[in-house]
């Protein structure tokens, strides 16, 4: 449940940030989403959070970038490798992160519904069995 709330908050922050057109959005950052398919979510979140932390040194930090960093860090590994050579703009980075998060939210949302139905079925079945 908390995981889904955090993802929902991240998506909201990303929607706010990607709607902006200030000079910070043209900042060059590492493209951390070119990682191998078997890379864990926690590793990807850690890499994304590392990129956001580096933005602080460019003084492009704002409330929502801080919030994004805070929320990503809460779901991420503490350390991760950052050996990407490819680059992208901050705007593209945020857009790609948004797509990833929307997919995760959709998948987890469906899982939550499925789990709730399983619990409901189990409780109903259990109740019926005892009476």
């Amino acid at each position: 449940h908390n995981f889904n709330i955090t993802i929902k908050e991240i998506i909201k922050m990303l929607n706010i940030l990607t709607a902006r057109n200030d000079s910070c959005m043209e900042l060059t950052v590492k493209d951390v989403f070119t990682a191998p398919k078997n890379t864990s979510d926690k590793e990807i979140f850690c890499r994304a959070a590392t990129v956001l932390r580096q933005i602080y040194t460019h003084n492009c930090s704002n409330r929502y970038l801080r919030g994004l960093y805070r929320n990503l860090s809460s779901m991420a590994n503490k350390t991760c490798s950052m050996n990407e050579i490819k680059k992208s703009t901050l705007k593209d980075f945020l857009e790609r992160l948004k797509v990833i998060m929307q997919k995760k939210y959709y998948r987890h949302g469906l899982n939550d519904i499925f789990e709730a139905q399983k619990i409901e079925w189990h409780e109903h079945h259990h109740h019926h069995h005892h009476h």
Epitope: K12, I16, C60, S61, R63, Y64, R66, R70
Partner: antibody, heavy 119, light 107 residues
């Protein structure tokens, strides 16, 4: 305990200048963006300006752009507001505020310093 | 004219639910914070990021935000809740505050 203490408020004539100071304690000052917010007598709150952690980035409300300048000295845990070409409508209590990290909001406020612009 | 619009005043009997609104175009797509200010005092953060309570703020304070309206609710208003309440959000030009709502608690 987080504390923000403003000083420098005074009575000044229209067209005059004033520099407000805000000394911070109880937290790692250099890790936080800082802002100034004012409140005219009997009126609402008005955001004026923000400064980034190392002072490289500043941002101003249209009402004070070109007249006010925000700066900071991380070694002294102090943020400043230099106010030039003051007008009667600048009369207000000026608050120094911290832009939070845990809370994406102004999580701590000073008690304010009164600036009166009058001839 | 503020980008965030609040009603100037609200009167409640003690124990009733007080509902403050903050209206702005698509405000639900942004984060809204609420501050309480008592006479002669500095504002205090009361709700942050739409619906979260800072430590030390009583449970009777809650918030929500969707569409064009953000809401602050006090469930069971008390005499000490009499104050001005301001909503605030970040827009492209910077931070903006609503005009504030004064709550009177009758009792």
């Amino acid at each position: 305990e987080v504390q923000l203490v403003e000083s420098g408020g005074d009575l000044v004539k229209p067209g005059g200048s004033l520099r407000l100071s805000c000394v911070a304690s109880g937290f790692t000052f250099s890790s936080y963006d800082m802002d100034w917010v004012r409140q005219a007598p009997g009126k609402g709150l008005e955001w004026l300006s923000e400064i980034s952690t190392n002072g490289d980035r500043t941002h101003y409300a249209d009402a004070v752009k070109g007249r006010f300048a925000i700066s900071r000295d991380n070694a002294k845990n102090t943020v400043y507001l230099q106010m030039n070409s003051l007008r009667a409508e600048d009369t207000a209590i000026y608050y120094c505020v911290r832009d939070g990290y845990e809370y994406l909001a102004f999580d701590y406020w000073g008690q304010g310093t009164l600036v009166t612009v009058s001839s | 004219q503020s980008v965030l619009n609040q009603l100037p005043s609200l009167s409640m009997n003690m124990g009733e639910t007080a509902t403050f609104t903050c209206e702005g175009d698509n405000i639900g797509h942004k984060y809204v914070n609420w501050y309480q200010q008592k006479p002669g005092q500095a504002p205090v953060l009361t709700i942050y990021e739409d619906n979260k309570r800072p430590s030390g703020i009583p449970e009777r304070f809650s918030g929500s935000n969707s569409g064009n309206t953000a809401t602050l609710t006090i469930s069971g208003a008390r005499a000490e809740d009499e104050a001005d309440y301001y909503c605030e959000s970040e827009v492209s030009t910077g931070i903006v505050f609503g005009g504030g709502t004064h709550l009177t608690v009758l009792g």
